[in-house]
Interface confidence: medium
Amino acid sequence: RRGAPAEDQDCGRLPDFIAKLTNNTHQHVFDDLSGSVSLSWVGDSTGVILVLTTFQVPLVIVSFGQSKLYRSEDYGKNFKDITNLINNTFIRTEFGMAIGPENSGKVILTAEVSGGSRGGRVFRSSDFAKNFVQTDLPFHPLTQMMYSPQNSDYLLALSTENGLWVSKNFGEKWEEIHKAVCLAKWGPNNIIFFTTHVNGSCKADLGALELWRTSDLGKTFKTIGVKIYSFGLGGRFLFASVMADKDTTRRIHVSTDQGDTWSMAQLPSVGQEQFYSILAANEDMVFMHVDEPGDTGFGTIFTSDDRGIVYSKSLDRHLYTTTGGETDFTNVTSLRGVYITSTLSEDNSIQSMITFDQGGRWEHLRKPENSKCDATAKNKNECSLHIHASYSISQKLNVPMAPLSEPNAVGIVIAHGSVGDAISVMVPDVYISDDGGYSWAKMLEGPHYYTILDSGGIIVAIEHSNRPINVIKFSTDEGQCWQSYVFTQEPIYFTGLASEPGARSMNISIWGFTESFITRQWVSYTVDFKDILERNCEEDDYTTWLAHSTDPGDYKDGCILGYKEQFLRLRKSSVCQNGRDYVVAKQPSVCPCSLEDFLCDFGYFRPENASECVEQPELKGHELEFCLYGKEEHLTTNGYRKIPGDKCQGGMNPAREVKDLKKKCTSNFLNPTKQNSKSNS
């Protein structure tokens, strides 16, 4: 289907590309001696980049620091030193640059202040960093300022004293709305959720915290949960892990009405050393990881129903090292329903798994064509592709980047990997899929940094090396053929590739430094590919592609979660611009229902290799430890529930007698005596 990648040799060489790129390569040398650089894009399609360089010398008692701030408004081709706008103040890099949501143009920089000061200091901009206003805070911030997703003028921050502070005017004035706060998050509609400790401290009260909500920025409050260990938001779901009465275990409770009513999730409870983790969530459902007892490094993935209450076991032995540790779980954003992760097998080897139907079934990644199985393979002809992600990076394997996919580069997935029976510690190669993970091909030999430009029209890569580099590689045909371009005669120690988030840009910035005997000088090269893709793409540059197609003869071919989607894809042979305004053209069509479109409802399960749901034997004639909306009530079910997000119509409708399931609510999580509303007067 696609040949092995080729570099430069008779591979559709682009005419005059060196001249075209040379004319569009812009160098900027930063005139300072900084030790670190951080870069942020301000707004979407604005071309504005802020670069903060910091230089720190730890002295015996205090540390001396200096920051410089640079601004570009042409996607990094030119930078202007704007340090004077922040009064040459040292900026605290651990807070980063707090960039406002959407295209608000808002930026907050948190400054370092001297020891005895009453509060912190921030520099605020609301005009894409053209101007900054210095503001002294009435508190010392513990976390970066958090913008409300709905209104970028509303900010919240935690102080080092665990106070919850809110601003309604983009940080000009602040008000402490609550003390003893451990964790705070914005919810929908400018709601703030937060946990508070009642007695000692956040750490000491873990499991005895209260979960509070304010819908009016701190005027009034409602306690929506007690005995809380932690909470999280995912999609339209609010989750809380709640301590059990009897022992030290805790359980997940879920709410879809901002905490007014709660239901106990049908998930295993966990002990002190275990954890829950929301791997992914959308408006339809959630992927939840439940840690195994003991220090195993793995757990189980469960997928929820549309209420977030009933969970189906999705994947066993899912690799997840520790709380806040490493997992390889990756949402492949270039194709609906696709996720990749790693499992830990009995022999402690790590294997990659992929699902194409939102966790319904997992399988190994297909072996790339024309590839050989490595030393990890028992059978040299049968093996699969294994993807390096966060865990490999944390283990300091030679993996410079996690897997990459972009919603507007339909079907494209790029990742480091090895071909065998398990992940190999040998130097990986880079593989690409153009169909959302169904098939793979080796794209580049050895580890590389990579990025997608122009919605997939160009892929750019740079070799991962500890020696200075001066070559960038690019492909205009989804990684089949590669051209090499020498972007500078003076090689640099490469530190990173930067392109505008969203993969719509045609500019790439290569960051690094040159080093002489005593000085290190930061430098960036921005390459604009607009002259490589000279013309705009036309209708005939695209071709139709049915996603998830595995059997073109079958009328259900391409059906995933009850519908199929056909996309227009750029032909590999077309060298043209999708353009900044490119919108993925897709045509959905509904599929007839089958049993695959339903999950088993509460009290039912699917025996292995069966498609029908049967009643769980251990629940027959028993009261169920299950709490719906915190009340005792009858739950009626026919054993099936449509999979969240499934759009099938007609076809099979699993009809069977409706059963009454008597339940006992065993959670006092919503003890009415503990429910109260308070005013902040």
Epitope: N536, E538, E539, T543, T544, P552, Q566, L568, V583, S589
Partner: antibody, heavy 126, light 107 residues
Framework: QVQLVQSGAEVKKPGASVKVSCKAS????????MHWVRQAPGQGLEWMGS????????NYAQKFQGRVTMTRDTSISTAYMELSRLRSDDTAVYYC???????????????????WGQGTTVTVSS | EIVMTQSPATLSVSPGERATLSCRAS??????LAWYQQKPGQAPRLLIY???TRATGIPARFSGSGSGTEFTLTISSLQSEDFAVYYC?????????FGGGTKVEIK
């Protein structure tokens, strides 16, 4: 209402060129692709190519490459198809047809041709 | 290019009867198929797009089905005005290609 009106019949000698016009009305001319299809006497339909009136970008069937030129004049909402080095087997009725596909979003790319001109008869004879 | 083959070349049907026309693609075109009707001396008219969706103003007796490589146009009860030539066209890829046509004549 939406319509495409083509120029009148032409009689040409072999080796000559013919230019057929197609005037659009009742819709935004630059918003939809224009296709050209021909039909020889007693034969089926044959797709010749298309033009994006918005950008002027063209796409020709391999068979006509080098002989056909499709252009447009957006100021008068008119598309043109010129066929050169005419042969006797180019005798046919030539149709312009609006593609349902939007030139801006690529939506409806796959929906066919919904409005057709009345056809222009081109006779090539010595 | 994708080759479209229609069968039969001619179909003789009595008024009021059902007519079934076939169209086969040399490779999968998913559901990207259009059907046209052409009467003598007239331009073609779009009947069906997306393999099964009727175009505006097309009577319900016309229906399309199929996906991938096999497609069918069905006229449930032939009226006198339905006797014409019918063409299928794949719109999955460029170049757009038509089938050779099926002539539906009065039996």
């Amino acid at each position: 209402q939406v319509q495409l009106v083509q120029s009148g019949a032409e009689v040409k000698k072999p080796g000559a060129s013919v230019k057929v016009s197609c005037k659009a009305s009742g819709y935004t001319f630059t918003g939809y692709y224009m296709h050209w299809v021909r039909q020889a006497p007693g034969q089926g339909l044959e797709w010749m190519g298309s033009i994006n009136p918005n950008s002027g970008g063209t796409n020709y069937a391999q068979k006509f490459q080098g002989r056909v030129t499709m252009t447009r004049d957006t100021s008068i909402s008119t598309a043109y198809m010129e066929l050169s080095r005419l042969r006797s087997d180019d005798t046919a009725v030539y149709y312009c047809a609006r593609g349902v596909g939007s030139t801006v979003t690529l939506a409806y790319y796959y929906y066919g041709m919904d409005v057709w001109g009345q056809g222009t008869t081109v006779t090539v004879s010595s | 290019e994708i080759v479209m083959t229609q069968s039969p070349a001619t179909l003789s049907v009595s008024p009021g009867e059902r007519a079934t026309l076939s169209c086969r693609a040399s490779q999968s075109v998913s559901s990207n198929l259009a059907w046209y009707q052409q009467k003598p001396g007239q331009a073609p008219r779009l009947l069906i797009y997306g393999a099964s969706t009727r175009a505006t103003g097309i009577p319900a007796r016309f229906s399309g089905s199929g996906s991938g490589t096999e497609f069918t146009l069905t006229i449930s009860s032939l009226q006198s005005e339905d006797f014409a030539v019918y063409y299928c066209q794949q719109v999955a890829n460029y170049p757009r290609t038509f089938g050779g046509g099926t002539k539906v004549e009065i039996k």
